[in-house]
């Protein structure tokens, strides 16, 4: 997960945009990525970075938990 997110974040050379990506990675079981992104007011660049990283992180976590289930963990 960390490697993949670092790969995505490396594209963003504006520090705030990069940090928007990292914010998207934070675990939040109560809201979807879209719901969380809707509260962002600093600009579309932040929304895009947040959403991309949030979705990727959610997918990777889902895949990992699915693998854990298959392995009977």
């Amino acid at each position: 997960l960390q490697e993949k997110i670092e790969e995505i974040a490396a594209k963003y050379k504006h520090l705030v945009v990069k940090k928007c990506c990292y914010d998207g990675v934070r675990i939040n079981h109560d809201e979807t990525c879209e719901q969380r992104a809707a509260r962002i007011s600093v600009g579309p660049r932040c929304v895009k970075a947040f959403t991309e990283c949030c979705v990727v992180a959610s997918q990777l976590r889902a895949n990992n938990s699915h693998k854990d289930l298959q392995l009977g963990r």
Epitope: K13, H14, L15, V42, G43, R45, C46
Partner: antibody, heavy 118, light 111 residues
């Protein structure tokens, strides 16, 4: 209407520090990044750094080698730029500006003249 | 850092003529179809004023005689026709990445 109002002119001795303020009004202060630029007499614009007041995130121009510190007071909607170890080459007009959509500077302060002289 | 090189450093134009200023970036300032190049006008004793953002979008209240174009590393600001009040310094600026950088400026004088 959006306004950025800066503090008044300063005259400083070499080696001292200066702290310039930039009071924002007419918009939600925490929604936009505040940048600081400077312009030496007869010269172009030099970017110094910025702060995102909502999170306190900052980034600085490495040319200033740790001499610059940018802070923000959300309670008063004011951003500050402090420059230390002043030298004569720091004599310039210092500007704050609001960055809209992480793309462009749509509003600027009126500028603060800082003169460094012994 | 992205270095922005403006040319010419100065130019004198007669009223009614066209003024063209170019800005060349040391690397592309485009990202996923968006251009992060902006232009500002600065008159003596005043702060810079936004003219054009994202290469070609006029800020509100800016006269239509100002226009911007370009992509990648090469950008142009055009004033056509030039008016006496356009005497000023003009700066390009990129916001794609930190550090934000400005061109060295172009001084436009009206003959």
């Amino acid at each position: 209407q959006v306004q950025l109002v800066q503090s008044g002119a300063e005259v400083k001795k070499p080696g001292s520090s200066v702290k310039v303020s930039c009071k924002a009004s007419g918009y939600t202060f925490t929604d936009h990044i505040i940048h600081w630029m400077r312009q030496a007499p007869g010269q172009g614009l030099e970017w110094m750094g910025y702060i995102y007041p909502r999170e306190g995130w900052t980034n600085y121009n490495e040319n200033f080698k740790g001499r610059v510190t940018i802070t923000a007071d959300k309670s008063t909607s004011t951003a500050y730029m402090e420059l230390s170890s002043l030298r004569s080459e720091d004599t310039a007009v210092y500007y704050c500006a609001r960055e809209r959509n992480l793309e462009y500077f749509d509003y600027w302060g009126q500028g603060t003249t800082v003169t460094v002289s012994s | 850092d992205i270095v922005l090189t403006q040319s010419p450093a100065s130019l004198a134009v007669s009223p009614g003529q066209r003024a063209t200023i170019t800005c060349k970036a040391s690397q592309s300032v485009d990202y996923e179809g968006d251009n992060y190049m902006n232009w500002y006008q600065q008159k003596p004793g005043q702060p810079p004023k936004l003219l054009i953002y994202a290469t070609s979008n006029l800020d509100s209240g800016v006269p239509a005689r100002f226009s911007g174009s370009g992509s990648g590393t090469d950008f142009t600001l055009t004033i056509n026709p030039v008016e006496a009040e356009d005497t000023a310094n003009y700066y390009c600026q990129q916001s794609l990445e930190d550090p934000h950088t400005f061109g060295g400026g172009t001084k436009v004088e009206i003959k």
